[in-house]
């Protein structure tokens, strides 16, 4: 018979046998044979391979380095890489989150419309009228300018995004 | 009954030939690899050689030893496999078992045994 | 060829002994190791195939094990009916080598 083109799932071509993939966790030290299956071996320590495979040499787990604001977020295992984050007050550069940067700060007349986290930096928005900010700040949101009404008061300065209203006492004459 | 009865054995001459037979019954015998085993008088187990199924096309493998003198063959529709000994020699006194090969990627062996047939090569 | 080779050649023992016979490989042989029993005059009979897997209809008193190149035939508590030569076989590279037999005598 023609020997096979084509192999099951979790399976590889070889020498014109089907032999079986090693198990997520494990590298391969030899094919199948006719009389034999294939040999895996565990991955060893802060090694690992996450998929059905035919890798001879298991991957090194990631190393989250703290020179440069990395952590662990998650420790791997011999079917998982692990996963970095970054440091209280910084954020992940990309996806792969390999190296930090400091959180962006909101400056005077924008809010924090979304705190950062380990993965996303500070996302800012203006204060729109009616709101101020007068700090530089990665977690201040845009205040709501004081009512002077509430305090039997008279707004005496205008606010700005910048800067509260000032309020004053009444004109009495105006009585 | 699942069995294999072989048969051919005798005296031969050096350089002579002899073909041994062995009858299966009792299973599908074209689905199995059949081998051929060896014990010369008094002494251990020696493989042969053995031939393939018919998933693998009855193809052969020998031992070092009698490649090139013996060959394995099989009629499956007498389920009978054969070896053809030619250029016999002394070394080749041996009972010479028949043996139905099986099992799994996870282990192959000799699961069924004939009872053996005496082959004396001598002058 | 991987040579296997098996200890002891011989060995005397009585009804309800504990035995062991050990098989050692030239090379890793990854647990394809089948035993056979063979007694005089008979044809060899398949006990223990990869290592630890016991044939149907062999008595449990049998077991093997073993990893590498080192592997152990074990007969828990020998019978009148276990007195016979015990062989070896690797079956993980052509051409299929035998153990040289150990025969286990009645004391």
């Known amino acids: 018979p023609e020997p096979p083109t084509a192999c099951r799932e979790k399976q590889y071509l070889i020498n014109s046998q089907c032999c079986s993939l090693c198990q997520p966790g494990q590298k391969l030290v030899s094919d199948c044979t006719e009389f034999t299956e294939t040999e895996c071996l565990p991955c060893g320590e802060s090694e690992f391979l996450d998929t059905w495979n035919r890798e001879t040499h298991c991957h090194q787990h990631k190393y989250c380095d703290p020179n440069l604001g990395l952590r662990v977020q998650q420790k791997g295992t011999s079917e998982t890489d692990t996963i970095c984050t970054c440091e209280e007050g910084w954020h992940c550069t990309s996806e792969a989150c390999e190296s930090c940067v400091l959180h962006r700060s909101c400056s005077p007349g924008f809010g924090v419309k979304q705190i950062a986290t380990g993965v996303s930096d500070t996302i800012c928005e203006p204060c729109p009228v009616g709101f101020f900010s007068n700090v530089s700040s990665a977690f201040e949101k845009c205040h709501p300018w004081t009512s002077c009404e509430t305090k039997d008061l008279v707004v005496q300065q205008a606010g700005t995004n910048k800067t509260d209203v000032v309020c004053g006492p009444q004109d009495r004459l105006r009585a | 009954e699942v069995q294999l009865v072989e048969s051919g054995g005798g005296l031969v001459q050096p350089g002579g030939s002899l073909r041994l037979s062995c009858a299966a019954s009792?299973?599908?015998?074209?689905?199995?690899?059949m081998s051929w085993v060896r014990q010369a008088p008094g002494k251990g187990l020696e493989w042969v050689g053995f031939?393939?199924?018919?998933?693998?096309?009855?193809?052969?493998e020998y031992a070092a030893s009698v490649k090139g003198r013996f060959t394995i063959s099989r009629d499956n529709s007498k389920s009978t496999l054969y070896l053809q000994m030619n250029s016999l020699r002394a070394e080749d006194t041996a009972v010479y078992y028949c043996a139905r090969y099986g099992g799994l990627k996870k282990g192959w062996y000799f699961d069924l045994w004939g009872q053996g047939t005496l082959v004396t090569v001598s002058s | 060829d991987i040579q296997m080779t098996q200890s002891p050649s011989s060995l005397s023992a009585s009804v309800g002994d504990r035995v062991t016979i050990t098989c050692r490989a030239s090379?890793?042989?990854?647990?394809?190791l089948n035993w056979y029993q063979q007694k005089p005059g008979k044809a060899p009979k398949l006990l223990i195939y990869?290592?630890?897997s016991l044939q149907s209809g062999v008595p449990s008193r049998f077991s093997g094990s073993g990893s590498g190149t080192d592997y152990t035939l074990t007969i828990s508590s020998l019978q009148p009916e276990d007195f016979a030569t015990y062989y070896c076989q690797q079956g993980i590279n052509l051409p299929w080598t035998f153990g040289g037999g150990t025969k286990v005598e009645i004391k």
């Open positions: 090379q890793g042989i990854r647990n394809y």
């Open positions: 009792g299973f599908t015998f074209s689905d199995y690899y």
């Open positions: 031939i393939r199924n018919k998933a693998n096309a009855y193809t052969t």
């Open positions: 990869y290592t630890s």
